[in-house]
Each structure stands twice: as C-alpha cells, then as structure tokens.
C-alpha cells in the first residue's frame, strides 16, 4: 500500500482551478526526493506533466505548478484554465513514475451550469467591483430600467431608475443612465460579497416588448497563494487592491483559529506586539498599492495572510481582499546569528550580519528601524561607504568574514542606540534579518583617553588598555572613514596599569603618530578581533592644531542632525545615483558624509608585532 | 461557532445500504473540509472519507477500507453533506461522527479538526 495520500476524486468546471494536494511521510529521503505529476494513458505508462524539479509539459505551460511543502509532507499541484480535455485519471507520486510511491487521482472537468441563451458571464473576486451592461431598444429608453436577482423561480427587485435599491444592496449599488443615443444602461456594484453570486437579470420597459438580458454574476473567494520562506529570513506580500480603494486605509491581517483576522499592521499605526522591529507597511502607489515586509521569521508566523482596505483599518465583508498562506520552512539556509547583542554605554557592538552567499558582490546595507506609523528604515552605512552624518567616526560596514556573513560595528555607544536593526542587501531580499541591540549596565573592556589634540610637526602617543581576557585576540588600531577602517601599525608596549585586578596579561597597545600632520586629524579606533571576527572597539577623535599659536582652539567633531532627506528601506525597485539596486525602491535620495581623509594619510608609527592587515576595506 | 448534527444510523443487515447526513449550521462560510469519521467499540477512531471544496471545485478523500463502496456528497444550499455507505460489512459497525475543518491545508486523514457531531450509531448485522 503506497504511504502518498491525496483527493480520489477531484471535480472542477471548465475555466477554473485546482488546488491538489498530496500527502506523504515526511522521511529526509522523502522530502527531498522529486515530486510529480503524470497523467496516465491509454498504455498504462504515465506521462509527467509537471515535477518539483522544474519540468512542466507543454500542455501545462502557463497555468501549472507543483510546490513541495517538505516540513509538511505535502506537495501541491495548481492548474489553472481548465478544460474539458482535462477530464482523465492523473497520479500524483515520489520518486519515479513508474514505481509504487503514488497515488491515483480521478479529475472531472465539466461544462459550467447551463445558462439561458445570450447570458454574459462576469466572474470578479469578493470586494471589487462589477459593472453590468443591459442594453436596451429606443422605444424603451423613456420607461423604467430595472435589475433583478433570480433565486429559483422567483425574480428579487434589486435597482430601479425610480430610485428604488434593494436593503442589501444599500450604499453599494448604482444605476446608470447615458445621454440619448446611447441605448445601454449599467449597473455597478461596489464591494461585492459572495452572497451576491448568481443570476441577473437586466430589464428595459415592461410588456411583451420589453428587453432583457441575462447576467451570471460569479463572485470568487480569492485562492491563497503559496509562500515558503526560510525560518529567520524575509516575507513581502504584495498587495495591490485595485484604485477603487486607493484612499482607504490598508491592512494586513493573520486569520487565526476562529477564522476572524487579527491585525499585523495597518496605515492607521496599529501593529500587532509580536512583529515589533520586524514589520515594514511600505507608503502605497498611486494606484492603492502597497507592500509589508517581516523579517526574522519564526515557526509561529505561519499561517493564512489577508490584506484588504477599509476605513476601520480591519476585515469587514465585501471589500476587496488579497490572500497568502505562508508557510516557515525549518530547514533554513539562513544561517542563525545572535537575534540580541548587548553592550554597554560607551562600549561598542559588532553584529554579524548573513547575506546570501552566492551574492558575494551585492550591496550591504544596515538600518534603523523606527516604528512610528506604518514602521520605517533609514540607512545607516553601506558597503560603499555611505554613512549617516551622525554616526559619523563610530560605525562601520565591513565584508569580512564574508562568505555569506557582514560585519557592522558601533560604537561609543548610549542608551539612544538601543532598537531594531536590519541587515539587508540589494540582491535576495529573503535574507533581510532584524537584530536587536540592547544597552545593558557595565563599563567598556578598552580603555583610551578622551579627545586628543595633536600638535603639528610633534609626536603622539595613544594608548589603548585592554584586559586580560582579550590576551588571545588580535589587537589593532585603525583610521576610521566613510569607506571603513584602516588598520594602522602599533605597538603592544606591555603590561597596563589601567586594571588593577588583573595579572601582567592586562596589557595596551599603542598607536604612534610621528610626525603628525593635517591629515591625521580623524577619528581613531582601537580594538580587538580573531581572524576574520571582530570584538569590541574604542574611539578617539584627534584634533590636529599648530604648534603653540596664540588663539588656537579644539576642534570638535561636532554630532551632525540627521539628513532631512535619508534613505529609507522599503520593497520595490528604484535607481539611486546610477547604481541600479535590484529590489529596493529600496531607497529614497540621502546626503554622503564626506570622505574624511585619505585612510592612515600620514601616520608614520612604531612598528611591532602586532597585525597591519587591512580591515574591513576590502572584502578576503 | 459551528454545529454539527449526524443522522441516519441505525440497524442494517450485511451488504445492505444507508445514507447518513450531516447538517451544519453557525459559520458554516468558514467550513472548507468536512468528513467521516467512525469509532467501533474499544478502538481508536478512524478516518472514513471527508470532502474539501474552495470556489466550484471539490475534492472527495477515501480510506482504503471503504473505497468503492461508500460516496460522500455535499448540498451546498442546505449546508450538508451526506455519506451513502453501501455493500456495508459488519466491520463497518461503528459510532460515525461528522466534522468541519477550517484548513485547505491540513491532512483531512487527520483528527484535528476544528468541529465535531455527537455521532450516529450504524450497526451492521444479521
């Protein structure tokens, strides 16, 4: 007996779809063995029409899929247009075709319900909007025009040109005269419900001279369509609700057991707690159209997704609605990475960052999510250097360890920096993740000194004291710009009295500038990193003045406000500054920090034995 | 809520038929899966048949035990579906319970559906 389970019998009408799903123990050899299927012939043999390996016969092409869900030990198989000709006896299976591990299925298509001579037939999903168009002949265009509804033998009043409307059509509902010489009238209707399926009958006059006309009316429930996202990567839904609604407030909505829909997000600012950090509502098209990002899926994110529009801001019957059932898939290629990271005030944080491997050279991008209104994410720093005037001298992107992972590293940090971050790229859009960074109680493990002015022509000394438990790591110093950091040679100079409940491990290492000139003036970063890994960092600007001139003063590296006019992450496409980026419409216009300084320009330093291989400028 | 009402059980003999219904009333526009189910005495219950349906198509699930035999059915209008069991075989005494499912996804074999009848007796002998 084979273990694959599916519908015996499936039974459609001509110009629909079907949705069949197949069943089969979920083994690791069973979840990732092909899935077909085949229609069986006249010879026995089975003859494959669509796989889980891309093949789709030519009679399919267009209007077949086969989707494996293999957590779920399901495959499913949509055919859409169907015809007659489709009618016949299928298998769905794993493996081969011709062997045991299938299923048969019986598929009957059949001609749609017999309608009356000349009937047009309108078939529109739930919540749009029909126009029905009734002709007429002139002698009838003074007298009364009039739709009804047939239910059964009986014919149900529905509009009339003498203004009268049907209660369940109230609010929603138009008839519609032209000018003379137009010899049609329509009737619209708004916000259709499935209760409005049905026949129509359109009538011009009365007596044996009257004109009719029939209508079918099919109003559809939207099919779900299928998503598989990877556990702890990125779902967008694209909804696109038609103009009729463009000015109505938006939703999306997760129907729960009860088969009400409880709220993710909406344009009125509600957003369910448990997509805190993580959810985007992007600004809508003109035409009404909009989109939602989660990032950081979880196993509790599956489910069945609605999106709609309604002035409450929630699902209300009969207006227009798009569905999805996401399905998390556990055997993710994303790889797990700390969904927390903690620092202390003053201290710094490097987040690893994954990135889909096979896209080595996409842009990476780190940003803030803020959640006001509908959420939003203005980038902070990318690969190409660009970063925000306000962190400028204590955030950096860097490629390494590449390999499908980025670094970002902030520090000097405060209480203001606690929040939600997003890693993304300008490639696959399914591996944007969201972390969180948390300002716990302690004090920073490097210890430098505060600002530093440099006297021109003279030699300068900064000291970095780090603790015993980073004797292991690789310590360096760096020159920080826009573009990233560039390590500098220094010198570990032995044991440091700046930790006095440590042994002689507690050491510091050095930077030299000698001589210093204009151009070492800059932000300066001490810090600690195994291989490709980086620790904790410190920084300390260097302001450079001349030598004992009168009314010479410090130089602040003043804190810039934020750009007005930011980029901000949302999920279309766009170009900014010629650099085609494929998904975002990522991104609106934003001002660029000025490269500040060549990197390591003129620090002559001492020499020892610590590393001087380049950080984070280029990608190993 | 849903409710869910069986009958149409009752005493039959060996190759005999009958035709049992399942009425739903409540939210029944949220139902999209209904089956049969069926519990003999001091046995686990079992999966008999179930119907899905979504727009104008429908799809009809059969244990291996009843195929051929049994056809289940579904009267859109007056929110029922019925079971017409025929060649019954004394094995197929039982208590059959109807049940609704909200889910186009879940495994209709499964009992984990959203709603349940109290279940009509079919007893099969001679």
């Known amino acids: 007996k084979s273990p694959v389970f599916g519908p015996q019998e499936v039974s459609s009408v001509e110009g629909n779809s079907v949705s069949i799903k197949c069943y089969y123990p979920p083994t690791s050899v069973n979840r990732h063995t092909r899935k077909y299927w085949c229609r069986k012939g006249a010879s026995g043999r089975c003859i494959t029409l669509v796989s889980s390996e891309g093949y789709v016969s030519s009679n399919y092409a267009g209007r077949a899929n086969l989707t494996n869900f293999p957590e779920n030990g399901t495959f499913v198989v949509n055919i859409a247009q169907l015809s007659r000709d489709d009618s016949g006896h299928y298998k769905c299976g794993l493996g081969i075709n011709s062997r045991g591990l299938s299923f048969d299925v019986s598929l009957e298509v059949s001609q749609g319900p017999e309608l009356p001579n000349g009937t047009e037939v309108y078939t529109v999903d739930v919540g749009r909007t029909v126009t029905i168009k009734c002709p007429f002949k002139t002698e009838n265009a003074p007298k009364t025009k009039a739709l009804y509804k047939k239910i059964g033998q009986t014919s149900v009043l529905v509009i009339d040109s003498r203004n009268y409307v049907n209660p369940n059509y109230k609010d929603r509902i138009r008839l519609r005269i032209p000018g003379t010489g137009q010899l049609i009238f329509t009737v619209v209707i708004d916000r259709l419900r499935l209760s409005d399926h049905g026949l129509y009958l359109c009538q011009a006059g009365d007596g044996s001279n009257r004109d009719e006309k029939n209508a079918d009316l099919q109003v559809l429930e939207p099919e779900p369509e299928l998503v598989y996202e990877d556990l702890r990567g990125s779902v967008t839904f694209h909804c696109a609700l038609g103009l009729e609604v463009a000015n109505v407030a938006k939703f999306l909505c997760r129907v729960n057991s009860r088969e009400t829909c409880d709220v993710v997000i909406n344009t009125l600012g509600k957003r369910d707690s448990a997509f805190e950090g993580r959810i985007l509502l992007n600004p809508q098209d003109k035409d009404g159209s909009f989109s939602v990002v989660i990032t950081g899926l979880r196993k509790e994110d599956e489910g069945r997704y609605l999106c709609g529009a309604h002035s409450d801001g929630q699902l209300q019957e009969g207006w227009p609605i798009q569905a999805w059932q996401l399905f998390v898939n556990e055997e993710s290629t994303i790889p797990r990475s700390p969904t927390v990271v903690k620092g202390v005030a003053g201290g710094s944080v490097a987040v690893l960052c994954p990135y889909n491997p096979k896209e080595s050279q996409s842009l990476k991008y780190w940003c803030l999510w803020e959640g006001a209104q509908n959420g939003r994410c203005p980038l902070l720093v990318e690969s190409q250097g660009l970063v925000q005037e306000q962190y400028e001298g204590r955030l950096s992107l860097l490629q390494e360890p590449g390999n499908g992972t980025f670094t970002v590293i902030l520090n000097q940090l405060t209480t203001q920096d606690a929040g939600f971050y997003w890693c993304l790229t300008n490639g696959d859009t399914r591996w944007r993740t969201t972390v969180e960074i948390k300002i716990i109680e302690g004090e920073p493990n490097l210890k430098v000194p505060g600002n530093v002015t440099a006297v021109l022509g003279e030699t300068l000394n900064i000291p970095c004291h780090f603790p015993c438990k980073f004797s292991s790591y690789e310590k360096y110093w760096c020159k920080w710009s826009n573009t990233g950091c560039q390590t500098l040679p220094s010198q570990d100079e032995g044991p440091s009295e700046a930790f006095v409940n440590c042994d002689e491990n507690s050491r510091l290492v050095s930077l030299t500038l000698n001589p210093v000139t204009r151009a070492d003036e800059g932000w300066y970063w001490c810090g600690v990193k195994q291989g490709h890994f980086y620790g904790e960092t410190a920084a300390v600007y260097v302001a450079v003045e001349e030598k004992k001139v009168a009314g010479s003063r410090y130089v602040s590296p003043a804190k810039a406000d934020a750009a007005p006019d930011e980029k901000v992450l949302d999920s279309g496409v766009r170009e900014i500054e010629n650099k085609a980026i494929q998904d975002p419409r990522l991104f609106a216009e934003e001002k660029v920090v000025a490269d500040t300084g060549d990197q390591a320009g003129g620090s002559r330093a001492s020499v020892d034995s610590s590393s001087s291989e380049e950080q984070g400028g280029s990608s190993k | 809520q849903v409710q869910l009402v069986e009958s149409g059980g009752g005493l039959v003999q060996p190759g005999g038929s009958l035709r049992l219904s399942c009425a739903a009333s409540?939210?029944?526009?949220?139902?999209?899966?209904m089956g049969w189910f069926r519990q003999a005495p001091g046995k686990e219950r079992e999966f008999v048949t179930a119907?899905?349906?979504?727009?104008?198509?429908?799809?009809?699930y059969y244990a291996d035990s009843v195929k051929g035999r049994f056809t289940i059915s579904r009267d859109n209008a007056r929110n029922t579906v019925y079971l017409q069991m025929n060649s019954l075989k004394p094995e197929d005494t039982a208590v059959y319970y109807c049940?609704?499912?909200?889910?186009?996804?879940?495994?209709?074999?499964?009992?984990?559906?959203?709603?349940w009848g109290q279940g009509t007796l079919v007893t099969v002998s001679s």
């Open positions: 409540g939210r029944t526009s949220s139902i999209s899966t």
């Open positions: 119907i899905r349906w979504s727009g104008s198509s429908s799809y009809k």
């Open positions: 049940a609704a499912q909200m889910s186009l996804w879940r495994d209709p074999r499964e009992i984990d559906y959203d709603y």
